[in-house]
């Protein structure tokens, strides 16, 4: 099985124990590590952070002691903007310049492949996204002709049904991608006005969502029905939780909220907590399991957080094995307890290790 793990370059800027550099990663934990994110400047793939080249080097030296480890560079992301991707993909010259710029950039900096993180193609971009993937793959095949190992091509796709329908020709893009990471999280957010888990495995009776699509099981099944081969589908598992501020004394699933939860001490983003911050939060909190959805949530005062723990990730791994998927994807290594100092187990990357162990179990 693949264990595809994202590392985010901006995690270096978190203060104190939240700061994570690639040299803190475990070289034997994941089969693939994806560095997020690269930029596109003037139709050319490029660095984003001032010290990206140094961090690329740190990441790729992990392969010195584990030659089986593959590293990819992810281009795009939330801050990149869909419009910028759209302009590049829809113009033949821009798209082809971008594609041509990729192999030498990846080779120079020691990466084994490219991950496309266009979040998200619009309805008019669907065909262009397919063309981008098809032409990129053709370039990778051609570039590898002089006896080089072919560069890998993957994409991170939304798990939301509406986005899947408007953005992706699943059957076509699946032909050209080496694997597809389905982002089976962020199903539920503060915009709903109620509490709810952002990454439930199943819908469950407790689900207050207005639809039956906002869960991992539906998204995976839908992708498979649309023609994604199970052998290429990698299922996303978050090492972060989504939090809410409760608006009343109700604390269950579907309780009214006044907005996102208070920012974490290190991640400093309202409504989001890293797993290592959740471990802190759990001291003195009340933990509940949403039985049908097979995921936990915790409450403390007026704060509510839905997250994944070692038990829920094992359930998710068992599920992906039952569906004969290619493996699991983790967003993100730097949100797990990467130092092993927060979650009281004396174990670095406890969630990712639980996923790895479950994947290896017979």
């Amino acid at each position: 099985y693949k264990l595809v793990c994202y590392y985010t370059s901006w995690s270096q800027y978190r203060e104190g124990d939240g700061s994570c550099f690639p040299d803190a990663l475990d070289r034997f934990l994941c089969t693939h590590i994806i560095y997020s994110f690269a930029n596109i400047s003037n139709d050319h793939i490029d660095t984003w952070e001032w010290n990206d080249v140094t961090l690329y080097g740190m990441l790729n030296t992990l392969k010195n002691r584990n030659p089986n480890l593959k590293t990819l560079l992810s281009v795009g992301g939330w801050n990149f903007g869909s419009q910028r991707f759209s302009k590049i993909a829809s113009n033949t010259q821009s798209r082809r310049t971008f594609i041509k710029s990729v192999p030498p950039f990846l080779r120079t900096h020691g990466f084994d492949g490219l991950d496309l993180a266009w979040l998200y193609p619009g309805r008019r971009d669907k065909q262009h996204f397919t063309t981008l993937i098809k032409e990129m793959k053709a370039e990778f095949i051609k570039e590898a002709q002089p006896g080089k190992k072919q560069l890998l091509l993957s994409a991170a796709l939304s798990a939301g049904k509406v986005t899947i329908d408007s953005s992706y020709d699943i059957a076509k893009i699946s032909q050209h991608l080496d694997f597809i990471s389905i982002m089976t999280y962020d199903f539920h957010g503060a915009w709903r006005g109620t509490t709810g888990h952002h990454s439930p495995l199943f819908r469950g009776q407790e689900d207050a969502s207005p639809d039956r699509f906002s869960n991992t099981d539906y998204a995976v099944g839908y992708m498979l029905r649309l023609g994604a081969p199970a052998s290429k589908l990698v299922m996303g598992i978050p090492t972060f939780g989504r939090s809410f501020t409760l608006a009343s004394s109700e604390t269950g699933v579907g309780a009214p909220i006044s907005g996102p939860g208070i920012p974490g001490r290190f991640t400093k983003e309202a409504g989001t907590l890293a797993y290592y911050e959740i471990c802190d939060f759990l001291r003195g909190a009340t933990v509940h399991r949403i039985l049908g959805q097979q995921v936990p949530y915790a409450t403390k005062g007026n704060q509510w957080v839905g997250y994944d723990d070692q038990e829920s990730v094992k359930s998710k791994v068992q599920y992906l094995k039952d569906r004969q998927l290619a493996g699991a994807m983790v967003w993100a290594l730097d949100l797990d307890d990467f130092q092993g100092s927060f979650c009281g187990q004396d174990l670095r990357f406890p969630l990712t290790n639980a996923i790895k162990d479950a994947l290896a179990a017979t």
Epitope: N39, S41, H44, D46, T47, Q93, K100
Partner: antibody
Framework: QQLKESGGGLVKPGGTLTLTCKAS????????VCWVRQAPGKGLEWIGC????????TYYASWAKGRFTTSKTSSTTVTLQMTSLTAADTATYFC??????????WGPGTLVTVSS | DVVMTQTPASVSEPVGGTVTIKCQAS??????LAWYQQKPGQPPKLLIY???TLASGVSSRFKGSRSGTEYTLTISDLECADAATYYC????FGSGAVDSPFGGGTKVVVE
């Protein structure tokens, strides 16, 4: 792995000349081949490039468009056709092979003199 | 269009010294900057690409760095063989190609 330019020489103003860039030990599959010139005692001036597998085609400096045309004539040969030449075009012309806009391999250059 | 301004036009340093050449891009070109060395009667030779990556076979005495839109080539432990003219180049290509990608050049004299 070598590149060699040929076809330079003396040409009258208003005349036409075709330079050839020949590769030995390599072919031009999936490479960008570019032309750069250097007037006597001056700096480097980019003319234009061709993507030899025609994925991104040809592209030129704005001043060279229409008067300079680069083509791939075989797997190891690229040409640069220059028309309406003036004394200002007197220079050593280099061809260079690039992966991503930077040129790792250069020919020794060929001198073009435009004079009556 | 991007304009590359290279300074100084010439510099003289003794053997063993250090030379710093700067190249200012008129707008952001990210890491798409290359440095070349050219000796009289010879074609240019690639030294650095992607702003800081050393080309194959080039001495580690040559170092490229970037700060915003300013790029620097540093030559340390200067040798007589380093006497040459150095050029920076915006290495955008295809749809991103710029009209005048080369800087004006810096002549390095080794005393």
């Amino acid at each position: 792995q070598q590149l060699k330019e040929s076809g330079g020489g003396l040409v009258k103003p208003g005349g036409t000349l075709t330079l050839t860039c020949k590769a030995s030990g390599i072919d031009f599959s999936s490479n960008v081949v570019c032309w750069v010139r250097q007037a006597p005692g001056k700096g480097l001036e980019w003319i234009g490039c061709i993507d030899t597998d025609d994925f991104i085609g040809t592209y030129y400096a704005s001043w060279a468009k229409g008067r300079f045309t680069t083509s791939k004539t075989s797997s190891t040969t690229v040409t640069l056709q220059m028309t309406s030449l003036t004394a200002a075009d007197t220079a050593t012309y280099f061809c260079a092979r690039g992966d991503a806009g930077y040129y790792a391999l250069w020919g020794p250059g060929t001198l073009v003199t435009v004079s009556s | 269009d991007v304009v590359m301004t290279q300074t100084p036009a010439s510099v003289s340093e003794p053997v063993g010294g250090t030379v710093t050449i700067k190249c200012q891009a008129s707008q952001s070109i990210g890491s798409y900057l290359a440095w070349y060395q050219q000796k009289p009667g010879q074609p240019p030779k690639l030294l650095i690409y992607y702003a800081s990556t050393l080309a194959s076979g080039v001495s580690s005495r040559f170092k490229g760095s970037r700060s915003g839109t300013e790029y620097t080539l540093t030559i340390s432990d200067l040798e007589c063989a380093d006497a040459a003219t150095y050029y920076c180049q915006c290495s955008y290509f295809g749809s991103g190609a710029v009209d005048s990608p080369f800087g004006g050049g810096t002549k390095v004299v080794v005393e």
